[in-house]
Interface confidence: medium
């Protein structure tokens, strides 16, 4: 394995799936340093290539629920306030790190799962094939 | 704490901050259900409200290095491409989950973290304050 | 600029060790994996294993396992490649390649190798 | 083990001409390929990853397609010091496995 200029304070593993298998402090720390992070919550009114956002729970994930955008449109609002179907609403998409319970329903064991989550949408200029 | 029907099949935690340290399985299942998440990777240049992508790098943190959305103009791209500053260009923020190694340097120990991204950006109508 | 530069050729006879380093420049090394592949002459690329630097972890392909071990020491930034039992078909140029743990545009790009070494020839003749 | 099939095994073309080089997967990978160039007696560099994504500094000419168990590598108009052998890579499962190479040479 990789050998880490080691902290004598370090926690062993005696665990038969190290290093597979590794401590988890749940006590989340919360790095957003900037106290009052501007809330993107109206964008997705807002925004010319707006969404609507769904809930999808899961009791044996953390975090056990995620809101997902869904594009409300296939194009884009315009000035007039109306859909121009000459642009594209897309979502865009992020992987997120999860835990997933597992075993399932264990309380203290979990496995980390990457999942892909809309996270709102944007406005884009279609890609237009033309066909010879 | 949460009580979940137990699995006798759970690994015991013997750790003193249990059930605040959990073993998790670093196996990474990807969930994408999916089987093509079509990848964003060019909207960053199609969309109407661009953006550029920078480098944040953390040696302590997983992932280590986490590439962060910055809108490049205050305006949104208007049909003749220059920027119209009617419209703003927001960055779409999420939190996500890393992992840290804490203590620092120890392979084996981490702590849950979450963290504020900025993922892409999306076009607005701007909110105007009209000064009595 | 990231650079991996590995060790020189090695001549050893069958049964014997080798043992291969990787020394990586530029960039976190906790911030990557580092894979070994290897290329017989005049054929294709073979996966052997590899290592993700942040947590330790290793993997081996199967046809390897038990004869390859993988290290890596972060004070020196340098990975390692060690494969016992040597016969005439482990005659090859041995790679080790860059695996970016990176959060890129929404997405965890982790297993493209994006940087190579050069290659060290490993020679194995009785 | 997932198994990458590549076609062509060779192949000889003009300067200025299109190439296409494809790679099949024998199961679903999703987009986790990668595509590799290696010229004689240097390391492989890598040229797209995840199926279509450029890589910085590589030629504009170099693009990929193609999702699931079928891929495809595009030159679109070839130059002199493209000439060598590229390589398909998948990363959905261990063991990574690799495609068994294409050379293109300059007619």
């Known amino acids: 394995g990789i050998t880490i200029p080691r902290n004598p304070g370090c926690p062993n593993s005696e665990d038969k799936n190290f290093p597979r298998t590794v401590m988890v402090n749940l006590n989340i720390h919360n790095r957003n340093t900037n106290t009052n992070p501007k809330r993107s919550s109206d964008y997705y009114n807002r925004s010319t290539s707006p969404w609507n956002l769904h809930r999808n729970e899961d009791p044996e994930r953390y975090p056990s629920v995620i809101w997902e955008a869904k594009c409300r449109h296939l194009g884009c609002i315009n000035a007039d306030g109306n859909v121009d179907y000459h642009m594209n609403s897309v979502p865009i998409q992020q992987e997120i790190l999860v835990l997933r319970r597992e075993p399932p329903h264990c309380p203290n064991s979990f496995r980390l799962e990457k999942i892909l989550v809309s996270v709102g949408c944007t406005c884009v200029t279609p890609i237009v094939h033309h066909v010879a | 704490g949460i009580t979940i029907p137990r699995n006798p099949g759970c690994p015991n935690s013997e750790d003193k901050n249990f059930p605040r340290t959990v073993m998790v399985n670093l196996n990474i299942h990807n969930r994408n259900t999916n089987t093509n998440p079509k990848r964003s990777s060019d909207y960053y240049n199609r969309s109407t409200s661009p953006w550029n992508l920078h480098r944040n790098e953390d040696p302590e943190r997983y992932p280590s290095v986490i590439w962060e959305a910055k809108c490049r103009h205050l305006g949104c791209i208007n049909a003749d491409g220059n920027v119209d500053y009617h419209m703003n260009s927001v960055p779409i923020q999420q939190e996500i989950l890393v992992l840290r190694r804490e203590p620092p340097h120890c392979p084996n120990s981490f702590r849950l973290e979450k963290i504020l991204v900025s993922v892409g950006c999306t076009c607005v109508t701007p909110i105007v304050h009209h000064v009595a | 600029e990231v650079q991996l530069v590995q060790s020189g050729a090695e001549v050893k006879k069958p049964g014997e060790s080798v043992k291969v380093s990787c020394k990586a420049s530029?960039?976190?090394?906790?911030?990557?994996?580092i894979s070994w592949v290897r290329q017989a002459p005049g054929q294709g690329l073979e996966w052997m294993g590899g290592?993700?630097?942040?947590?330790?972890?290793?993997d081996y392909a199967q046809k390897f396992q038990g004869r390859v071990t993988i290290t890596a020491d972060e004070s020196t930034t340098t990975a390692y490649m060690e494969l016992s039992g040597l016969t005439s078909d482990d005659t090859a140029v041995y790679y080790c390649?860059?695996?970016?743990?990176?959060?890129?545009?929404?997405?965890?790009?982790?297993?493209?190798?994006?940087?190579w070494g050069q290659g060290t020839t490993v020679t194995v003749s009785s | 083990e997932i198994v990458l099939t590549q076609s062509p095994d060779f192949q000889s073309v003009t300067p200025k001409e299109k190439v296409t080089i494809t790679c099949r997967a024998s199961?679903?990978?999703?987009?986790?390929l990668h595509w590799y160039q290696q010229k004689p007696d240097q390391s492989p560099k890598l040229l797209i990853k995840?199926?279509?994504e450029s890589i910085s500094g590589v030629p504009s000419r170099f693009s990929g397609s193609g999702s699931g168990t079928d891929f495809t590598l595009t030159i679109n108009g070839l130059e002199a010091e493209d000439a060598g052998t590229y390589y398909c890579?998948?990363?959905?499962?261990?063991?990574?496995?690799f495609g068994q190479g294409t050379k293109v040479d300059i007619k």
């Open positions: 995840y199926a279509s």
């Open positions: 890579h998948q990363s959905a499962f261990l063991p990574y496995t």
């Open positions: 290592i993700t630097n942040f947590f330790g972890i290793v």
């Open positions: 530029g960039g976190s090394f906790s911030g990557y994996g």
């Open positions: 390649a860059r695996e970016p743990n990176e959060f890129w545009n929404g997405y965890y790009a982790t297993h493209d190798f994006d940087y």
């Open positions: 199961q679903n990978i999703d987009s986790e």
